[in-house]
């Protein structure tokens, strides 16, 4: 079999999310050494970097400016070592927003609810669309899909204090082109009273996976890495 | 805004060789990513060359790789593609293109990823 060196990680800076005419940032995390990076878009080479000098980082940043449908779509990555090359990091679904109009969001029976209500999202946009698309701040991985001609609702089911939280939604024009976001409508869901006060509010922390984590090697590393090296051998 | 403007087209026997220019207005020159892409009758617009922003790191499509030479001048605000070896399957318009604005030092090989473009400049290879 081919030998291939492991596949890297493939991350959006900030979000995946990107409004039209924004710069989106993607990292490739791969391997110090890696003398190339390329980046793929829908299966056809998109861009190039070569780290000066490769045995200092591991990882690149691929900047796209000017986003717009024609580079929303799928995107991989892979790196090289000498001539040896990579598998192919996953695939990571990059996505244009604010394309054309504004949906309305709403909920029944209201934003405030009891634990164990059940509860709906209205999502409503009078552009012609087929797809709407609910997501919960803090959550943005996390999308519920829905269909409808200008209006879709997400059912929620029997709610608990883990619902609790803003949302909004997009119409969507295909997988990877959206609409602007609506404005957001905050869910507050009460718990049961001896409840009330241990119930956790869901907190709406940035999407942590969302950040390059791109490090530069340093001497002091290098030599920890060698003292660790020679130590293993001489534990052997 | 950025305008783009490729010149030294023409017609050129197979072997020869010639040097397109692509001048570039505006100040943001210096942080675009640059690329040649060439579109022949009848057939795709396809890559040919590209060059980063700042350490002329460059790319080539294997069909012009050892026979074309892709520069930058910054403080001309040009971009050059050295054509030599020519071949009648090099016969196209030639289009310039710019990526802006760049950071780091990514080239860009997709049509996608460029957002501003020449109008073409038509090399004929034929003896």
């Known amino acids: 079999p081919k030998q291939t060196l492991p596949k890297p990680i493939i991350r959006a800076e900030s979000t995946y999310m990107v409004p039209k005419e924004k710069q989106a940032t993607l990292c490739c995390q791969g391997s110090y050494g890696a003398v190339e990076y390329q980046l793929h878009f829908e299966g056809s080479l998109f861009a190039v970097e070569r780290p000066k000098p490769p045995e200092r980082i591991n990882g690149v940043k691929f900047h796209i400016p000017d986003m717009n449908s024609r580079k929303a779509g799928r995107y991989s990555c892979i790196y090289r070592v000498g001539e040896l090359w990579s598998e192919r990091s996953d695939l990571l679904d990059l996505v244009v927003t604010e394309m054309y109009d504004t949906p309305t969001l709403s909920v029944h029976p209201g934003p405030e609810v009891t634990s164990g209500e059940k509860v709906t999202f209205y999502c409503r946009l009078d552009t012609a669309t087929s797809m709407f698309l609910l997501l919960k701040e803090g959550r943005s991985r996390d999308v519920q899909r829905s269909y409808g001609k200008v209006q879709a609702e997400f059912p929620m089911g029997p709610v608990t204090t883990a619902h609790r939280g803003s949302y909004r939604c997009f119409g969507s024009y295909n997988n990877y082109a959206w609409s602007f976001p609506s404005e957001p409508v905050k869910l507050l869901v009460t718990g049961d009273i001896e409840n009330t006060s241990l119930a956790p509010t869901d907190p709406t922390f940035p999407d942590s996976w969302d950040t390059c984590l791109l490090t530069r090697e340093t001497g002091l590393q290098k030599d920890l890495a060698l003292w660790d090296h020679t130590a293993q051998n001489l534990l052997r | 805004e950025v305008q783009l403007v490729e010149s030294g087209g023409g017609e050129v026997q197979p072997g020869g060789s010639l040097r397109l220019s692509c001048a570039a207005s505006g100040r943001t020159f210096a942080s675009a990513a640059m690329g040649w892409f060439r579109q022949a009758p009848g057939k795709e617009r396809e890559f040919v060359a590209a060059i980063s922003r700042s350490v002329d790191d460059t790319y080539y499509a294997d069909s012009v790789k050892g026979r074309f030479t892709i520069s930058r001048d910054n403080a001309k605000n040009t971009v050059y593609l050295q054509m030599s070896s020519l071949r009648a399957e090099d016969t196209a318009v030639y289009y310039c293109?710019?990526?802006?604005?760049?950071?780091?030092?990514?080239?860009?090989?997709?049509?996608?990823?460029?957002?501003?473009w020449g109008q073409g400049t038509l090399v004929t290879v034929k003896p």
């Open positions: 293109a710019a990526v802006v604005p760049t950071y780091g030092n990514n080239i860009y090989v997709h049509s996608a990823a460029y957002n501003y």
